[in-house]
Interface confidence: low
């Protein structure tokens, strides 16, 4: 708030703008016949300095030199980097109530000189842009710093544009806005940043650099794709590029992928030809141009082209299963099973499957479409059967896959041995056996199959399976693996017209049932109890029921209970007890035991034997 | 030989509606890029609307008809069809099909009349005030 200095004047010596460490000399002179009073002597001029608007001190004590009641000298010392104000007031001694008054002030700025600039670096974005240019301008001045780029070409031509930095902006670019065309593309040209502050200039060393070193090709674009007849694995991809351009790089990748092909086309003229696309699979497809062969800069990629290769043929071999059931004494229904292909294997939208049944001998064959995963006929118990399906989409069918028709588990000494389910995780189940002791003949394959032992799975929900080498003896099952299920596991033993299975149940994970099993009748026969049950629902047993467990004792008694244990067996829901005392009132009740523990009791029911005793 | 036979054209009041085809003989396009032009009398042809032919068939439609037009095709049948709703009188045009014979997702080239290689002879739409 200092009002256009009427009362004085304030001076810097050696100049407002000083070289960081060095000191500066501050006058502050009243103007004539201003001042307290009409005696001088009550005059005192003081030095107050700001720093951000901040005082920050009186400098009263840095005094040099004194007129008193005219002029005032003090010198200051230890400035920091970049601005500080000085304010002179005027203090009248002989009147304390009054505040002092301020005079004039100055700013002094604390810089230092421009570094050379370095690290030029010019470029053209595209034939039509304009030359533009950065720099690294060293370390910070703090002052106002003017930067002036120069160019100098054929024809003695120079030119130059300006830019500045300060507090508030920095100037480490710029655009001269000239173009430098293809016909200059041997001409050799010059560029310097020379810079300029109150502390003094520096000149970057000159930069030379021709047409192709910095023109940097726009992306191409217009990109495209034709597929030659229709391929799903050939095509030639097509792009719009700027006239000098003499080397492509192209890159391009399925939209699920991380990872680029890249590909080097020189002189390609806006077309290249992939022989390796996968058919019927999103891609996504980019190109970068470059002017020269060895010098000069990529272009930015262009915009992605993202297309879907046509179909092909399917390839791969469906993954085929069955079951057999026989109807009766002389029919029997098969059911045929397959995996979908994976996409690089199917190539295009499956349409339908071609299902094919044959008799081998009779040479009767029935055959179907389908667009399901599944098939089931039913067929003569007696010849050999073989069955194969292949997979179709617009373009195609893949290969037939066959397997014979063999009763799976109707050759004992095919019987894999020592079967068992470990536990691996919560979604996954570590099968493992040792291969059929006594094979008549050699084992080809194993088929590890698995199904969800709940009400109705076999009918309505297709089986899982896992082919494996007969090399192998364990199998990891982890498709439709839940928590707290309890699984029916086989493991079949294929040889070329046999088969042998072993069967197990097993979990991923357990817990102790929710309830017992409840028992519905208790009956005497023969001087011996027959406990029927129904099982437990079977989303209550949270994984497989190792056994059961029928407890009883007499009514009013407070002694242990007795118990028998059962060998779980799904078929099965009666047991006999014969250790019960006649016209004794019993309790009986059951639980239901997993590998994490027992259930709850079940219901509770009384009953009295008649009979005579054991 | 290829022929591309448009039809639906007419007469009709501002603010109806008519429906547009085209039918492709010769040749299966419903992996390709078509597309509607029109061309009023003493005017060049404009594009209006097209398909890309590309996985997912993306639809591109001038600025003017958005939301008026609507572009379609059966690729079983070979036929591409123009919905147009709430016509006005600068809609009367001569309305041409045109096909490529090769996928275009580039929104410059699906308006490029130099883009397709096949062309109907055009079907006239009237818009009458």
């Known amino acids: 708030n200092i009002d256009v200095c009427k009362l004085g004047t304030v001076t810097v010596q050696p100049a407002p703008v000083i070289p960081l460490g060095s000191a500066a000399n501050i006058s502050c002179s009243l103007n004539p016949k201003q001042g307290c009073s009409h005696y001088p002597s009550s005059n005192e001029l003081i030095l107050l300095k700001f720093v951000n608007d901040v005082l920050v001190e009186n400098l009263h004590g840095k005094k040099v030199h004194d007129h008193t009641g005219h002029s005032s000298t003090f010198q200051v010392t230890n400035l920091s980097l970049g601005m500080t104000l000085f304010v002179c007031k005027l203090n009248c001694s002989n009147s304390q109530k009054k505040p002092p008054v301020p005079v004039c002030g100055v700013e002094i700025s604390v810089g230092v000189a421009p570094e050379p600039p370095q690290n030029i670096s010019c470029v053209q974005e595209g034939e039509n842009g304009t030359v533009a240019c950065s720099w690294n301008s060293g370390k910070v001045t703090y002052l106002k710093t003017n930067y002036t780029l120069q160019l100098s070409g054929p024809n003695n031509l120079t030119c130059q544009k300006q830019c500045f930095s300060d507090n508030r902006q920095n100037c480490n670019r710029l655009d001269l806005g000239i173009n430098l065309s293809p016909d200059l593309a041997e001409s050799r040209f010059i560029v310097r940043v020379t810079a300029i502050n109150d502390l003094g200039n520096s000149s970057s060393l000159p930069h030379t650099f021709t047409f192709l070193d910095i023109v940097i090709p726009l992306p191409p674009w217009d990109i495209r794709i034709n597929f030659l007849n229709a391929s799903g694995s050939r095509g030639t991809l097509q792009w719009e590029d700027e006239g000098q351009v003499v080397l492509n790089q192209l890159r391009y990748q399925p939209l699920n992928s991380t990872s680029w092909n890249m590909v080097n086309a020189t002189n390609a003229k806006g077309k290249y030809d992939l022989r390796d696309l996968r058919p019927f699979t999103e891609y996504e497809f980019q190109i970068s141009s470059k002017l020269h062969l060895s010098g000069g800069s990529w272009s930015n990629w262009s915009e992605s082209l993202r297309t879907r290769t046509p179909e092909e043929e399917p390839v791969g071999i469906l993954d085929i299963w069955y079951m057999k059931q026989d109807i009766d004494y002389d029919r029997q229904q098969i059911s045929l099973f397959w995996k979908s292909l994976n996409p690089s294997e199917a190539r295009g939208k499956i349409l339908h499957y071609q299902v094919t049944l044959q008799e081998v001998t009779k040479k009767t064959t029935l055959q179907n479409t389908t667009r399901h995963t599944s098939w089931t006929r039913v067929i003569p118990r007696t010849g050999a059967w073989t069955a194969s399906v292949s997979a179709a989409n617009s373009k195609g069918a893949s290969a037939p896959t066959h397997i014979n028709i063999v009763d799976l588990c109707g050759t004992g000494l095919l019987a894999p041995h020592q079967v068992s389910a470990k536990s691996e995780n919560m979604d996954n189940i570590l099968v493992t056996w040792q291969p059929p002791k006594k094979a008549d003949s050699a084992v080809r394959e194993y088929i590890v199959e698995w199904r969800a032992l709940q009400p109705g799975s076999i009918t309505k929900f297709p089986p899982h399976w896992l082919r494996i080498p007969p090399d192998n003896m364990s199998a990891l099952i982890s498709e439709n693996i839940k928590p707290y299920i309890c699984y029916e596991i086989r493991v079949h033993a294929l040889s070329e017209s046999q088969g042998g299975c072993s069967s197990i149940r097993g979990d991923s994970k357990h817990k102790a049932p929710v309830s017992g099993p409840h028992i519905t009748a208790i009956t005497e026969k023969k001087e011996r109890l027959f406990i029927s049950w129904t099982h437990i629902p079977f989303p209550e047993q949270r994984g497989c029921i190792l056994h059961y467990r029928i407890y009883w004792k007499e009514r009013d008694s407070t002694a242990q209970p007795e118990l028998c244990e059962i060998q779980y067996r799904r078929s099965q829901n009666s047991h006999p007890i014969s250790s019960l005392q006649p016209r004794v009132t019993y309790v009986l009740w059951m639980t239901a035991v997993t590998a994490a523990g027992e259930s709850p009791q079940g219901n509770e029911r009384e009953f009295c034997p008649q009979g005579k005793a054991n | 030989q290829v022929q591309l036979q448009e039809s639906g054209g007419g007469l009709v009041q501002a603010g109806g509606s008519l429906r547009l085809s085209c039918a492709a003989s010769?040749?299966?396009?419903?992996?390709?890029?078509m597309a509607w032009f029109r061309q009023a009398p003493g005017t060049e042809r404009e594009f209006v609307a097209g398909?890309?032919?590309?996985?997912?068939?993306?639809?591109f439609y001038d600025n003017s008809v958005m939301g008026r037009f609507t572009i379609s095709r059966d690729s079983a049948k070979n036929t591409m069809w123009l919905q147009i709703n709430n016509l006005k009188p600068e809609d009367t045009a001569v309305y041409y099909c045109?096909?490529?014979?090769?996928?275009?997702?580039?929104?410059?080239?699906?308006?490029?009349?130099?883009?397709?290689?096949?062309w109907g002879q055009g079907t006239q739409v009237t818009v009458s005030s």
């Open positions: 010769g040749r299966t396009f419903s992996n390709y890029a």
């Open positions: 045109a096909a490529a014979t090769h996928v275009v997702v580039n929104y410059g080239l699906v308006r490029r009349r130099g883009t397709y290689d096949y």
């Open positions: 398909l890309s032919g590309s996985g997912g068939d993306t639809a």
